[in-house]
């Protein structure tokens, strides 16, 4: 969490951002809130990016003002216009690119004063893993697949019964480049699994951590997946 305060001149207002991560090819949110103001027509929101000449986005007098917008963000940004009056300056970024990573500034002017806060935005790819029993294999084998990751993650297997065990000798992980030549498909196979046990396939890079669990018993198979972004710090 980053909390910024206003600059000299008018009163300062509190602006708060939260570091976040964007998933390449999907839409992302750059989070920013500020002390609300009931005078909507006086509110100005500017999003800037370090190293970029033009603005990322500008909202003033109740609407987008995009004449100064940088080419790299053209047609890809929007604020939640209906939420500005209650202090939400968050930016929606469409079709996140690898190059969108960097330091952003959320700069706010209201009738009460000015304020700004920076935000670190990471970009990459992350997806939920799915763990299945591989019936084609000669021995009891689990196959963990996740369609899109970048940068290349690490994959670690764990088991509820054999807690702390190292499965690197009985697992094999491969990374296959996807058609857009950036993200990769992750496939990890675990051999010699035992019945009545819960296995977890954990995939992690510097942006996200995802876990796929599978419980195999005589009568049924239960699966569960979970994904967590690693760098959500407020400012």
């Amino acid at each position: 969490l980053i909390i910024g305060f206003g600059i000299s001149g008018r009163h300062s207002i509190t602006v708060t951002t939260v570091a976040s991560a964007g998933n390449i090819g999907e839409d992302g949110i750059l989070s920013c809130t500020f002390e609300p103001d009931i005078k909507l027509s006086d509110i100005v929101i500017q999003w800037l990016k370090e190293g970029v000449l033009g603005l990322v986005h500008e909202f003033k007098e109740g609407k987008d003002e995009l004449s100064e917008q940088d080419e790299m963000f053209r047609g890809r940004t929007a604020v939640f216009a209906d939420q500005v009056i209650v202090g939400n300056a968050s930016l929606r970024l469409k079709n996140v690119q690898l190059t969108d990573a960097g330091t952003y500034k959320c700069y706010i002017i209201t009738s009460k004063g000015k304020g700004n806060a920076n935000l670190e935005y990471k970009t990459g790819a992350f997806s939920m893993p799915e763990v299945n029993v591989d019936y084609n294999a000669s021995s009891e084998t689990l196959r963990c697949e996740a369609p899109r990751w970048f940068p290349q993650p690490t994959v670690v297997w764990a088991s509820q019964v054999d807690q702390g065990a190292n499965f690197s000798e009985v697992s094999n992980t491969s990374f296959e480049l996807n058609s857009e030549n950036v993200t990769m498909k992750v496939v990890s196979v675990l051999y010699n699994v035992t019945i009545n046990n819960t296995y977890s396939c954990m995939i992690e890079n510097d942006i996200a951590k995802a876990t796929g669990d599978i419980k195999v018993t005589e009568s049924e198979i239960k699966r569960r997946s979970h994904l967590q972004l690693l760098n959500s710090k407020a400012s």
């Epitope: 009931i38 109740g62 609407k63 216009a81 939420q83 009056i85 209650v86 202090g87 009460k112």
Partner: antibody, heavy 117, light 107 residues
Framework: QVQLVQSGAEVKKPGASVKVSCKVS????????MHWVRQAPGQGLEWMGA????????EYAQKFQGRVTLTADTSTSTAYMELSSLRSEDTATYYC??????????WGQGTTVTVSS | DIQMTQSPSSLSASVGDRVTITCQAT??????LNWYQQKPGKPPKFLIY???QLAEGVPSRFSGSGSGTDYTLTISSLQSEDFATYYC?????????FGGGTKVEIK
Amino acid sequence: QVQLVQSGAEVKKPGASVKVSCKVSGYPFTSYYMHWVRQAPGQGLEWMGAIYPGKSDTEYAQKFQGRVTLTADTSTSTAYMELSSLRSEDTATYYCTSTWTHYFDYWGQGTTVTVSS
Amino acid sequence: DIQMTQSPSSLSASVGDRVTITCQATQDIVKSLNWYQQKPGKPPKFLIYYTAQLAEGVPSRFSGSGSGTDYTLTISSLQSEDFATYYCLQFYEFPPTFGGGTKVEIK
């Protein structure tokens, strides 16, 4: 869930003052504006003013400037509206209304103030 | 201050009718307009925000539209529980101002 609970009906004499309370629960009281709107019998809605409890910032409609005072007690999440120098045309129902997710999204049940000699 | 002119001030309609209420602002309010429904002895109920977005729990027979200075609330098929007074509110310019109200009565 969000609730705005106002104090009970009041009967006042001309020239007196009235203080209406509005107790809030269900959202962070200090971080969002609380407004006051009144409605005379059979009439429309009229905005009176607003307070930002976190900093006690206030904004008043010009018509009520100098006669209305908005305050907030952050320890009890209660907003207050005091109207002084009452006259018969101040007979109305007074509402508190929040701007939490949107402008005037939640309303108190209303407090009837009758000014009569 | 921005003036909001609401019309008609009252109308009579039957269950199943399509009802349209308009609000005109004295200047561009950039879609910063909400609609409220009020029944006798009750506080106003939040209906539509930012011109066209339905508040939580509001039936889909209600819809809002408009831009610039002209805005409309439409009830596609009037139900018995919709007989009430409707108000528009602009919050673009300070101070926020309400329309005069439209009373929807049973024909």
